[in-house]
Amino acid sequence: KAMHVAQPAVVLANSRGTASFVCEYASPGKATEVRVTVLRQADSQVTEVCAATYMMGNELTFLDDSICTGTSSGNQVNLTIQGLRAMDTGLYICKVELMYPPPYYMGIGNGTQIYVIDPEPCPDSD
């Protein structure tokens, strides 16, 4: 079953290569367990960046080596992606799945274009 997911169209990563955006879903019913996946689309290739399953009332827990962190509040998930470089510029898509209770719902956002600009190296000082 389909579900509407909203996310910002464009986000600019900061100078430390960190980008944050909100992924909001329109829950069609009660949801106590939610899975959030961030996908990156570039050159028609789609790769999974990170994923987390959380039970309502709990923080999102990504894998220890994940570049993502996040918090949840109601039907909103605040996602932060770290360690980005210019080559990581691309469309980052938020996918939300309502895992429990049934029925299963899934929604995919239109994507957030994240622009990453590598900082200029400091000029050597004489």
């Epitope: 019913g29 009660k30 009332g57």
Partner: antibody, heavy 119, light 113 residues
Framework: EVQLQQSGPVLVKPGASVKMSCKAS????????MNWVKQSHGKSLEWIGA????????SYNQKFKGKATLTVDKSSSTAYMELNSLTSEDSAVYYC????????????WGQGTSVTVSS | DIVMSQSPSSLTVSAGDKVTMSCKSS????????????LAWYQQKPWQPPKLLIY???TRESGVPDRFTGSGSGTDFTLTISSVQAEDLAVYYC?????????FGGGTKLEIK
Amino acid sequence: EVQLQQSGPVLVKPGASVKMSCKASGYTFTDYYMNWVKQSHGKSLEWIGAINPDHGGSSYNQKFKGKATLTVDKSSSTAYMELNSLTSEDSAVYYCARDGSIHYVMDDWGQGTSVTVSS
Amino acid sequence: DIVMSQSPSSLTVSAGDKVTMSCKSSQSLLHSGNQKNYLAWYQQKPWQPPKLLIYGASTRESGVPDRFTGSGSGTDFTLTISSVQAEDLAVYYCQNDYGYPYTFGGGTKLEIK
């Protein structure tokens, strides 16, 4: 027929811990959340938390975080709740209650485990 | 957390009487996504675990006598027993089933004259 068989009453000293069990039968254990509910003598009901028996993920009432720990053993279709650093405030009857199969509200309950904390 | 308030705390009636008890929630239990009210009613007889009577504010659980009726929407809910029987002696609890943490009302104790 769904059945939730809870462990027997316990008498423990202040500061101790207790681990109670809830053995499920009559349904696929991993398909439905298991909730735990506290009822102090003559009082209302308090939801402690819930656990997904499939992967062991749990959610707690903030009031019981650090007090209760929920776990499951899929092989024996048993849910457990451990209570630590017990005080007289923890003296109560504790129920396990399964999410229902149609409406996912607590519709099957164990008979309760009575915990008395006394020196 | 959603606070559930029940009234009256107790009432004494005669067999055959009609009884109504109230439950109010501190925020709406009506889900905008599916227009369902996430409220349940439980009956707890002495020395027994709670038993589900009503879910979705108005749907009777299988096997529950039709003298039990749930009604209401949003924040105000009512449980009605059309003709009280001696076996209805119990405490009745409403429960927020909207989301975690689930919360219960303080209960209404029904006593029979």
